[in-house]
């Protein structure tokens, strides 16, 4: 799977899930975002070549069809699979509040 | 929605559904399809800017993190979102077959 | 360009045994059934013999009239198709046609081999 | 086996006339939406050319006077204009199972 556990821990070119770090305040302007300052939101991103983690029947045959015509401007994309969500702490008001944004962290990828 | 009802009549540069003919036999060299000689298959394709069709809060956030670090590799791909099966007819010997290959046709992008 | 060359007709005596040749070119043999159709004098034409690729592991069909005394065979390497006539009788005289079937019709044909079976 | 049957057996027509053959099966040669009829001009001296496939599908270099159609186990392969080079014997034939058979054929003559 082009998950954290392996592509964190090889240097693979092709589509696997990279890590980045981002920080609500610097990064995003979010300033209502009280813990956590920053988390590790990863991206996908890398070439998708022929059968690489396909996600449906077609990107297997877009992904031969760019195979085979490597000048088509058609090809798969390194896209998110698995995401989890991220629990913060923000005020409204006074009033602390607890929320769990879904799907904020990329653990694996797929060529779809 | 970015479907082929609005990017197929529409000069749109960011992320949009395109046409994509595919022959079985000479883009694929898929001999063993006789019906149909080829389909639309479609492709996803443009830029994915803040907000537009963000699948998940992740594609969100990546989109805007983007917007406000330009250089940062990291951002948003336009991909399928909705496919439609497609219906072939090959021959296993002499006995034919008809077979419908699930999420073949491209019908609508979004920014994942 | 497709080309299929049959080889092997004549004139033979009831009994007797021929083999009839087809040299293939112009398509990848391999992946294809070839297929013997016959036309008897003032008579349509007839599913004989037929054999599939490797792929789908050389089965055969022959027709009910020749059953059991024809054999078609074919020699990927060689791109050739044979039709084995053993007992043959004066009913099995025809024109045999070596043909291919990429899908269903018989989109190329060979020019035909006379066979004629009499004493 | 599917048995087919071809109608007329033969037939008299003069150039520029519209001919229609038909083939009726003995059990629907189609499958889903693909009909899998096929039609042949076999001439005299000659092997037997491809002219309709999957009952309406023009084969390579066949002219476009040439047109099928029809499902189930009724087909039918239409001559918008006769010409001189069309008087043949036509046949029909289907791939729904095997064995594969063949109509009894439709020979046209010149009137």
């Known amino acids: 799977a082009l998950d954290t556990n392996y592509c964190f821990r090889n240097l693979e070119e092709n589509c696997c899930v990279r890590p980045l770090y981002i920080d609500f305040r610097q990064d995003l302007g979010w300033k209502w975002v009280h813990e956590p300052k920053g988390y590790y939101a990863n991206f996908c991103s890398g070439p998708c070549p022929y059968l690489r983690s396909a996600d449906t029947t077609h990107s297997t045959v877009l992904g031969l069809y760019n195979t085979l015509n490597p000048e088509a401007s058609a090809s798969p994309c390194c896209v998110p699979q698995d995401l989890e969500p991220l629990t913060i702490l923000y005020y409204v008001g006074r009033t602390p509040k607890v929320e769990q944004l879904s799907n904020m962290v990329v653990k694996s990828c797929k060529c779809s | 929605a970015l479907d082929t009802n609005y990017c197929f009549r529409n000069l749109e540069e960011n992320c949009c559904v395109r046409p994509l003919y595919i022959d079985f036999r000479q883009d694929l060299g898929w001999k063993w399809v006789h019906e149909p000689k080829g389909y639309y298959a479609n492709f996803c394709s443009g830029p994915c800017p803040y907000l537009r069709s963000a699948d998940t809060t992740h594609s969100t956030v990546l989109g805007l993190y983007n917007t406000l670090n330009p250089e940062a590799s990291a951002s948003p791909c336009c991909v399928p979102q909705d496919l439609e099966p497609l219906t072939i007819l090959y021959y296993v010997g002499r006995t034919p077959k008809v077979e419908q290959l699930s999420n073949m046709v491209v019908k609508s992008c979004k920014c994942s | 360009e497709v080309q299929l060359l049959e080889s092997g007709g004549g004139l033979v005596q009831p009994g007797g045994s021929l083999r009839l040749s087809c040299a293939a070119s112009?398509?990848?043999?391999?992946?294809?059934?070839m297929s013997w159709v016959r036309q008897a004098p003032g008579k349509g034409l007839e599913l004989v013999a037929d054999i599939v690729s490797k792929t789908y592991n050389y089965t055969t069909y022959y027709s009910d009239s020749v059953k059991d005394r024809f054999t078609i065979s074919r020699d990927d390497s060689k791109s050739t198709v044979y039709l084995q006539m053993n007992s043959l009788r004066a009913e099995d005289t025809a024109v045999y046609y070596c043909?291919?079937?990429?899908?269903?019709?018989?989109?190329?044909w060979g020019q035909g081999t006379l066979v004629t079976v009499s004493s | 086996d599917i048995q087919m049957t071809q109608s007329p057996s033969s037939l008299s027509a003069s150039v520029g006339d519209r001919v229609t053959i038909t083939c009726r099966a003995s059990q629907s040669v189609s499958i889903s939406r693909f009909n899998l009829m096929h039609w042949y001009q076999h001439k005299p001296g000659k092997q037997p050319k491809l002219l309709i496939y999957?009952?309406?599908n023009l084969a390579s270099g066949i002219p476009s006077r040439f047109s099928g159609s029809g499902s189930g186990t009724d087909f039918t392969l239409t001559i918008s204009s006769l010409q001189p080079e069309d008087f043949a014997t036509y046949y029909c034939?289907?791939?729904?199972?095997?064995?594969?058979?063949f109509g009894g054929g439709t020979k046209v003559e010149i009137k």
């Open positions: 999957r009952a309406s």
């Open positions: 043909t291919v079937a990429p899908g269903g019709s018989f989109d190329y």
């Open positions: 034939q289907h791939s729904r199972e095997s064995p594969w058979t």
């Open positions: 112009g398509f990848d043999f391999n992946s294809y059934g």
